[in-house]
Structures are given as C-alpha cells and as structure tokens.
C-alpha cells in the first residue's frame, strides 16, 4: 500500500495533512520496505547476500554513492548541494530500477512499486529544491545502451547486479534520509 493510503489515514479524517518533509520521509521508508521485500526473494534464490561488501565492490557498475563533497554528511553539510545530489542520484538510479523490472518472479509488483515510488519521490524533492538548474538528467541514449549491456550478462552476473543495485539503492536512501533529517 503506498504511503498515505493505509487504513489509519482513512480512520482519522481530522488528522493534520502531512508536511512536505513528512511526505518525503514516509515515501523513502515505503521504498526501503519495498527493497527489503525484493531482497528476500534475491537472497532466497542465490548466495549473493552472504558475499562481503568488499568482494561485491569489484564490479563495473557506476552506482550513485554519497561522498564528502556532496554536502550530505554532518561535516560540511550543505542543504542545497545535498538536495541536488539526492535528486541527481535518484535520477541515475532510475535506469537500474528499470533493469530490475524483469528480475523478479513472485515480487514483480513490488519491483514496479519501488520504481514508481521513486519517480514520485523525485517529484517531491524537486518541489523542495531551489536550484533545479544544477540537476543533471542522465542521457537517455547512454541509459538505453547500459540497460542492453546489463541484460546481456550471464545469469550469475545478473544475480550479482540485482543484489548490488538493491544494496546500493538502500544505502543511498538511508544516507538521504539521514541528510534530510538535518533539513
């Protein structure tokens, strides 16, 4: 159930509407819950989940990651720079979320929900950002060729790619939520 559509909301008509920050917080939590559900399926199917972070780091995926310069950490925190990084990162993750769409059997709907909820989250964050010009949108042609390349991998590499995308996306969202807690 997407955020804001649970029975508690229906049963409480006099509740204050969610603020922009609360809506973003709730949206990220919803996506993280979706990632947990997807990871249950991937971990049941392969032993990727037992692999160490270091072993998995030896890959060619250029997944978005928070760095000191992005202004999202406590030291050197910069609200606008950080917000731009969060939105840019989410836009970069979209191609990887598209790749995930055909990777699940029993959790097909959940994979779609994560993808659609991320699009909604990007919209929420874009409304919050003042400096939209600083946000670079990924090139569609580059994304299309990346998608083709990922889908052409052998089964083992596809399993590893799926696991890496989910884990990296989770860590990116957690870092985003930590940063948003300061805004």
């Amino acid at each position: 159930v997407p955020p804001g559509e649970d029975s508690k909301d229906v049963a409480a008509p006099h509740r204050q509407p969610l603020t922009s920050s609360e809506r973003i917080d709730k949206q990220i939590r919803y996506i993280l819950d979706g990632i947990s559900a997807l990871r249950k399926e991937t971990c049941n199917k392969s032993n990727m989940c037992e692999s160490s972070k270091e072993a998995l780091a030896e890959n060619n995926l250029n997944l978005p990651k928070m760095a000191e310069k992005d202004g999202c950490f406590q030291s050197g925190f910069n609200e606008e720079t950080c917000l731009v990084k969060i939105i840019t990162g989410l836009l970069e993750f979209e191609v990887y979320l598209e790749y995930l769409q055909n990777r699940f059997e029993s959790s097909e709907e959940q994979a779609r929900a994560v993808q659609m909820s991320t699009k909604v989250l990007i919209q929420f964050l874009q409304k919050k950002a003042k400096n939209l010009d600083a946000i670079t949108t990924p090139d569609p042609t580059t994304n299309a060729s990346l998608l083709t390349k990922l889908q052409a991998q052998n089964q083992w590499l596809q399993d590893m790619t799926t696991h890496l995308i989910l884990r990296s996306f989770k860590e990116f969202l957690q870092s985003s939520l930590r940063a948003l807690r300061q805004m």
């Epitope: 990220i28 939590r29 993280l32 990632i35 947990s36 990871r39 249950k40 971990c43 989940c49 972070k53 950490f73 406590q74 030291s75 925190f77 884990r167 989770k170 860590e171 957690q174 870092s175 939520l177 930590r178 940063a179 807690r181 300061q182």
Partner: antibody
Framework: QVQLQESGPSLVKPSQTLSLTCTVS????????VGWVRQAPGKTPEWLGG???????SYNPALKSRLSITRDTSKSQVSLSLRSVATEDTAVYYC??????????????????WGRGLLVTVSS | QAVLTQPSSVSKSLGQSVSITCSGS??????VGWYQQLPGSGLKTIIY???SRPSGVPDRFSGSKSGNTATLTISSLQAEDEADYYC???????????FGSGTRLTVLS
C-alpha cells in the same frame, strides 16, 4: 515479550576464536536488526558491529579484520566470531536489538532492548 | 572515530531534576541513545532514537537534541536513578556507533 540471550564459552585462550550466539524471542530477525556491544571491566561500552533485517552487516572499523557476524533466521540466532583474541578482548559481551527506525536511517547502533550480557575472559 | 563528550559526574538531590549532556560533531545527523547501567548490572536503554522511551521506562526520563548536543533529562530524581549513563550516536560513514565516556549520577538524600 522481547528477549535476547547471549551464550558461549566464558573462557577463551589467547590467539583462539571467541564465538558467541545471541538467541532472540518475541520478534523476528527479518523485521529487526541485532547488534553486538562489549564492555571491558571499568571501561565505556564499545560498539562491535551489527546485522540488519536484510542481513547486511556493519562492523567497527578497528575490529573489522577479526570480526564476523552472521545470522540464522530459522533458529532466531545471531552469531559473533572474533578471531585471534588477546587479553584486552576480555569484556562483558552484549547483544541488543536495533530500534525499528534504525533500518531506515542506517542507525544500527540505536538499540532499544539488551541481552543480559556474558562475561568472556581471555586467559591462558 | 567520532568523540562524544559527557560530564564525568553530576550530583543532585532527591526529587530535583537533572540534565546530562552529550556533545559531538556527529550528533546533528544521527540518532542518539541513552543507556543506564546500575552498579554491578548490565546496560539498559533509557532513550533510543533521540527521544523515544522503551516501554517500562518512566516518563520522568526524556531525551532531546539541539545542534551537536544531546540532552538526557531526569525529573523528580529517585534513589534508584543513581547509576552510570552513557550516550551513543553514529560514527558517520560506516553506520557504526560510538559511545560517550559516561556520566556517574549521584542522588543526594
């Protein structure tokens, strides 16, 4: 109710591996993370590491090379393994449940319920 | 590693209120926990996620934070509150935790 219980040997020889198990009840390991903390006699507690509800581990950088945390969800158990122990690893070892919100923020050290603790002495 | 600073000891009379502070550069972006250790006993959570109280902990205990300082406040002090109190927060970058040096609370009668 929510309970965590540490078990394992109370005496370990130097250079050996310290292996402890935390058995939990009243909650599922696929809904909550579990962390390990130790406290040497008369000292401040030290966060060792944890495993979250997805099975992802995080470790204290100072101990990362010697430490391993695993889980068995079917047995509701989380295990800690500390290799090449020395006398300074003598401490009370606690397992604790990470708060529900910790999953969303990655605040795995943020714990709400503790085990009773187990004193492990490293001595020959 | 991040460093958390706490006063080493505080003393207050029975029935009074006391505030114990915890300062550190990483507190602003991380949750803060407060843990009580009675003499000869194990650790017990008094406050987690900065201001949440586990069930069974009296509402005399409250937690808050402002900037890089977190505060544990205990109102209507009782004799059984005499203990060591530790704060803990995140060590940025590895999702790990770091504990404060601890504060010994003495309740004067």
């Amino acid at each position: 109710q929510v309970q965590l219980q540490e078990s394992g040997p109370s005496l370990v020889k130097p250079s050996q591996t310290l292996s402890l198990t935390c058995t939990v009840s009243g909650f599922s390991l696929t809904s909550y993370g579990v962390g390990w903390v130790r406290q040497a006699p008369g000292k401040t507690p030290e966060w060792l590491g944890g495993i979250d509800r997805d099975g992802d581990m995080s470790y204290n950088p100072a101990l990362k090379s010697r430490l391993s945390i695993t889980r068995d969800t079917s047995k509701s158990q989380v295990s800690l393994s500390l290799r090449s122990v020395a006398t300074e690893d003598t401490a009370v070892y606690y397992c604790a449940r990470s708060s529900y919100d910790s999953h969303y923020y990655g605040d795995y050290y943020d714990v709400d319920v503790w085990g009773r603790g187990l004193l492990v002495t490293v001595s020959s | 590693q991040a460093v958390l600073t706490q006063p080493s000891s505080v003393s207050k009379s029975l029935g009074q209120s006391v505030s114990i502070t915890c300062s550190g550069s990483n507190i602003g972006s991380s949750a803060v926990g407060w843990y009580q250790q009675l003499p000869g006993s194990g650790l017990k959570t008094i406050i987690y996620s900065t201001s949440s109280r586990p069930s069974g902990v009296p509402d005399r205990f409250s937690g808050s934070k402002s900037g890089n300082t977190a505060t544990l406040t205990i109102s209507s002090l009782q004799a059984e509150d005499e203990a060591d109190y530790y704060c803990a927060t995140g060590d940025r970058g590895n999702y790990g935790g770091v504990f404060g040096s601890g504060t010994r609370l003495t309740v004067l009668s």
